[in-house]
């Protein structure tokens, strides 16, 4: 039961995380105008990965896409690439993990195959989360650098008479969404990897085999159910006893003797 819970939770957390990464990537508020010097500005600027917007106090909002590819800063291109890679990996990971879910049965898929798929999706989620976190962090670093640069020459006086205020940008909502989403995807991926360990049948093919321990006769059926009640002192095949967690799991999938009362 614990493995299914871990796998299911990992899937849900990753799903939320990837949805968040997609949302952050599409959001326009990656950087927002710093209002420290003018908290009642009549014109508010904010920028995303794909377009920049201006919201006037009148309520009118105008957004313009970055229609150039070569004219954009390399860092922005890098951030876009990281976010897209994160989304693609996350989407593939979700697809793989759906088939890997223990509660979903597809034909006669072996547990070992499900374990491999769970691990694959887990790794994909981890890389996806790292890509998102890296992308957002690169952008944040770019903002911090630009912020202090524009602060250094905040006012460029024209003959000391006219002030030209340079617009400074600070962290937008998308950055926080991206960080949280990346973290969730990463956590989900780790959970999937943990679930994979519980799923993987080490050197066991679950054929009906009888093991004889000293003094006790303990037989094992497919699905890891004990035929007799004696545990004995079987240390040689300890992994099957690890199935303590697995046995609870299997109650969902396989009929136990209690089902036929």
């Amino acid at each position: 039961m614990a493995v299914t819970a871990c796998q299911g939770l990992g899937f849900v957390v990753s799903l939320i995380g990837i949805a968040g990464i997609i949302a952050a990537t599409c959001m326009d508020q990656w950087s927002t105008q710093d209002l420290y010097n003018n908290p009642v500005t009549a014109v508010f600027n904010y920028q995303g990965l794909w377009r920049s917007c201006v919201r006037e106090s009148s309520g009118f909002t105008e957004c313009r896409g970055y229609f150039t590819l070569l004219g954009l800063p390399a860092m922005l291109q890098a951030v876009r690439a990281l976010m897209i890679v994160g989304i693609v990996l996350g989407a593939i990971g979700l697809l793989v993990s759906i088939f890997a879910l223990k509660c979903i049965r597809i034909g006669s898929m072996e547990d070992s195959a499900k374990a491999n798929m769970t691990l694959t999706s887990g790794i994909m989620f981890i890389v996806s989360g790292l890509c998102a976190i890296a992308g957002v962090s690169v952008f944040a670093n770019m903002l911090v650098t630009n912020f202090w640069m524009s602060t250094a020459n905040m006012y460029t006086g024209m003959g000391g008479m006219v002030q030209t205020v340079q617009t400074r940008y600070t962290f937008g909502a998308a950055l926080f969404v991206g960080w949280v989403a990346g973290g969730l995807t990463l956590i989900g991926g780790v959970m999937m990897c943990i679930a994979c360990r519980g799923l993987a049948p080490e050197e066991t093919n679950y054929k009906a085999v009888s093991y004889h321990a000293s003094g006790h006769s303990v037989a094992y059926k497919p699905g890891g159910f004990k035929a007799s009640t004696g545990f004995g002192s079987n240390t040689k095949n300890k992994k099957i006893y690890d199935g303590g967690a697995r046995t609870e799991d299997e109650v969902q999938s396989y009929p136990s003797k209690h089902d036929y009362v």
């Epitope: 009642v40 904010y46 006037e56 009148s58 105008e62 313009r64 006219v162 002030q163 617009t167």
Partner: antibody, heavy 118, light 113 residues
Framework: DVQLVESGGGLVQPGGSRKLSCAAS????????VHWIRQTPEKGLEWVAY????????YYADTVKGRFTISRDNPKNTLFLQMTSLRSEDTAMYFC???????????WGQGTLVTVSA | DIVMTQSPSFLTVTAGEKVTMNCRSS????????????LTWYQQRPGQPPKLLIY???TRESGVPDRFTGSGSGTDFTLTISSVQAEDLALYYC?????????FGAGTKLELK
Amino acid sequence: DVQLVESGGGLVQPGGSRKLSCAASGFTFSGFGVHWIRQTPEKGLEWVAYIGSGSRPIYYADTVKGRFTISRDNPKNTLFLQMTSLRSEDTAMYFCARFYYGNSFDHWGQGTLVTVSA
Amino acid sequence: DIVMTQSPSFLTVTAGEKVTMNCRSSQSLLNSGNQKNYLTWYQQRPGQPPKLLIYWASTRESGVPDRFTGSGSGTDFTLTISSVQAEDLALYYCQNAYSFPLTFGAGTKLELK
């Protein structure tokens, strides 16, 4: 056709109060920010206060802050300006105006005259 | 606060003449986000409320004759009337639309010679 009609002006004693109203018609009032702007021959046009479409944000000119209160009743398509502690320098023609593209005022009322005098 | 300075205060013209009036702001009205200048021009005829002529420094409001042209960027702006008509005799105001408080110039009065 867009129409803004101010009312409530008149003669007020210094230190007194007055409430101005601006009735809007011909457009979706709840979709626009609106302002109060006043005009005197000496000072010319002076922006007084602004209220956003959903009653937020609200901004005031420093000269009226703490004395004037701008409000709106969207269902009744009406804008208000509650003026208290009136001074002689508040004597002016008060206009309400609709906020438009470029943070401009595209439609103005005919104005209502407020005279603060003993 | 942004201070708006208009010049000249009075302009005496003859019908059909080309007229230019200026407006200067104490701070740049150019918004880097959309490269638009947040300056507005109004016309006020005697006994009437102001009428919007131009916003974003050069965008004519619908219904405004094309003889009215707005130009300039940053801190220096110009309103040009290519051929003055009798109905153009009025007060012309420029307005800072970039930051609160929204401030107006003292106006330029267009008079007939």
